[in-house]
Interface confidence: medium
Amino acid sequence: ANSLLEETKQGNLERECIEELCNKEEAREVFENDPETDYFYPKYLVCLRSFQTGLFTAARQSTNAYPDLRSCVNAIPDQCSPLPCNEDGYMSCKDGKASFTCTCKPGWQGEKCEFDINECKDPSNINGGCSQICDNTPGSYHCSCKNGFVMLSNKKDCKDVDECSLKPSICGTAVCKNIPGDFECECPEGYRYNLKSKSCEDIDECSENMCAQLCVNYPGGYTCYCDGKKGFKLAQDQKSCEVVSVCLPLNLDTKYELLYLAEQFAGVVLYLKFRLPEISRFSAEFDFRTYDSEGVILYAESIDHSAWLLIALRGGKIEVQLKNEHTSKITTGGDVINNGLWNMVSVEELEHSISIKIAKEAVMDINKPGPLFKPENGLLETKVYFAGFPRKVESELIKPINPRLDGCIRSWNLMKQGASGIKEIIQEKQNKHCLVTVEKGSYYPGSGIAQFHIDYNNVSSAEGWHVNVTLNIRPSTGTGVMLALVSGNNTVPFAVSLVDSTSEKSQDILLSVENTVIYRIQALSLCSDQQSHLEFRVNRNNLELSTPLKIETISHEDLQRQLAVLDKAMKAKVATYLGGLPDVPFSATPVNAFYNGCMEVNINGVQLDLDEAISKHNDIRAHSCPSVWKKTKNS
């Protein structure tokens, strides 16, 4: 019906306005409505003007697109000619009454389909339904994927590419780990992936200044060390160093009036020379205190070495050895005086004898045929040595003696000359001052070591060697090496050390083979004024230990391997060190600090006497230990 109406209208238009010319009213009758008429008539007039001769001919030739009036007029009512819609975006154009309707292709909008729809911003279809990237394009859109993802065939969803499965050798010797959109080449801790070589390379943490003091790098890791010999230990962060702190303060008060006889491990502590009138006789008076059982108190000789007198201690008793042109004698007597108490001792040359008194009571009287030292040129010249003698004397002694004596003397009076001059010398030298109070034991000040040569081989035993150690300890700091066996190649095949425990105010005891801890006894309260007793026995097959809390035989998977390392070292030659380590690398043991405190050591049934050591640091006290510092009310 509609098309019939259109045909009718077209016929009327031909008749009324082309074959005849029409005015606006006549055109109104053709269209039967104002909007179409109002739209048509001005354009109709343009067509007329264009195809009328005369005035508008030039204009028509230049501007009109129609060949004749009919086609020009017929085209006026078609709102879709010329095309008002955007060519890219329209699907069809529908002519209407003085209007047009553009039908848009999908992805376009607007009256003339001139606006692209951004499907990526459509709130009803978020991101255009794309799982990753939505790319808007004129009239359309498409989904795409980020690197490392692949588009599924629905063209919307992106799936991660598993590069590890796709290219199994992508990481070389490292482990490939797939992650969304990518992959990672993973290395064990302490290694870094090298892209060029496609392999894991050790990180040199030491070059990154990870440690406060010393750093040792090894494949896959590193270890920090602190200089224990300078009093440092590794902090809990395993990187920084902290001072080894005192856990049991000791009374280290000294007095210059007290002369310390063990200042030197080898050598004389004091040397005096007397030139007196020839009528003078030898005399020595002093107070003496020691726990040591053997050693030289003083040695006196004539200027030409022809005569000498030795006052010593043997078995805790006074011993006198003398030699001159007339006689050669050795005498021991009196009570045991190595009791840690002050004992008044006097040695006096009388006309026919030498009198030895303890606490003013005569204990020995040694006959002598003539004067002890022969005067020359009207003078009696005498040399006196405290706590030792010249080296050449050793071979002349009637009975050999270990000269080292850990003891103190005070209130001395030699050759009836008093103490004048000597005190002034001693006052200047702190090392010569003796501790005010001491106890029985050996003291390691945390600054040095003692070395022994001990043969651990036991021919009668099937094990071949054994180490049975008993330690009585009263530490003053919670960290330090108590005992170490050191090989010729600077390794430490066995060590017993103390370390501050992670739990407060307690200590752990470590047994180590080289730099591996083979056993840790945890959380013992060792920093107390009471001594702690530790025992351990080790041979190539077993390790047994007893502490105040338990006795046990240690066994774990790795122990036999570690004991094999120890066995190999014991079959060679080992040196025994007490109180610390010699110059071995920091990394040779888990602990390298010196032990600080009192300690008595028994190895294979023999009580070690520090006076018998091959070498000993001068500050180690062989037979005296400072008392625990007691807090007084006014201190």
Partner: antibody, heavy 119, light 106 residues
Framework: EVKLEESGGGLVQPGGSMKLSCAAS????????MGWVRQSPEKGLEWVAE??????????YYSESVKGRFTISRDDSKSSVYLQMNSLRAEDTGIFYC??????????WGQGTTLTVSS | QIVLTQSPAIMSASPGEKVTMTCSGR?????MYWYQQKPGSPPRLWIY???NLVSGVPARFSGSRSGTSYSLTISSMEAEDAATYYC?????????FGGGTKLEIR
């Protein structure tokens, strides 16, 4: 739109041979990884074979149960993938699906073709 | 070869009910894929990379992992969800599928 259409199924005697075809359209076939998956009530879904695209030199992979008996091939000019099955056994019976494989998952499946191995 | 064990083998749920099915393997390193299959039709990819829904899959579906156990969950069961669901993993050849969980509507 992706389309996969299998053909070539039917009844075959044990020990016999059969060739399945799969015609593909709606995607760039030469780059695609294609595969065959079969389904039976006894074994459920079971991957059979895979052939990779041109970029991967048409590398082929097989499940242990068919290795040496089945051969997967393709003709990129015809956008088709094939499965030549020899020495067939009763346990090979099932619906064989042609699949488009994307990054190790079975992205698109055909409707399937049924193979029956029976005497 | 990884063996994927799906449980339960068969389950039923009422409309609106929450449904969870699991798939256990040996590896927690790889992605899990889930397929939905309705009778007479081939399986359709449903969830990929463990938890991503394929375009067009209703948001009531979700996927997750806990250790070596993977789950497919429907927050509120609908009649159209009745189907068999298969899990699949690739951890090097061969590709492996689970035995399936058949979900029925009560």
């Amino acid at each position: 739109e992706v389309k996969l259409e299998e053909s070539g199924g039917g009844l075959v005697q044990p020990g016999g041979s059969m060739k399945l075809s799969c015609a593909a359209s709606g995607f760039t076939f030469s780059d695609a990884w294609m595969g065959w998956v079969r389904q039976s009530p006894e074994k459920g879904l079971e991957w059979v074979a895979e052939i990779r695209g041109k970029a991967n030199n048409h590398a082929t992979y097989y499940s242990e149960s068919v290795k040496g008996r089945f051969t997967i091939s393709r003709d990129d000019s015809k956008s088709s993938v094939y499965l030549q099955m020899n020495s067939l056994r009763a346990e090979d019976t099932g619906i064989f699906y042609c699949c488009l494989i994307t990054a190790f998952l079975f992205d698109y499946w055909g409707q399937g073709t049924t193979l029956t191995v029976s005497s | 070869q990884i063996v994927l064990t799906q449980s339960p083998a068969i389950m039923s749920a009422s409309p609106g009910e929450k449904v969870t099915m699991t798939c256990s393997g040996r590896s927690s390193e790889n992605y899990m894929y889930w397929y939905q299959q309705k009778p007479g039709s081939p399986p359709r990819l449903w969830i990929y990379d463990t938890s991503n829904l394929v375009s067009g899959v209703p948001a009531r579906f979700s996927g997750s992992r806990s250790g070596t156990s993977y789950s497919l969950t429907i927050s509120s069961m609908e009649a159209e969800d009745a189907a068999t669901y298969y899990c699949q993993q690739f951890n090097g050849y061969p590709y492996t599928f689970g035995g399936g969980t058949k979900l029925e509507i009560r």
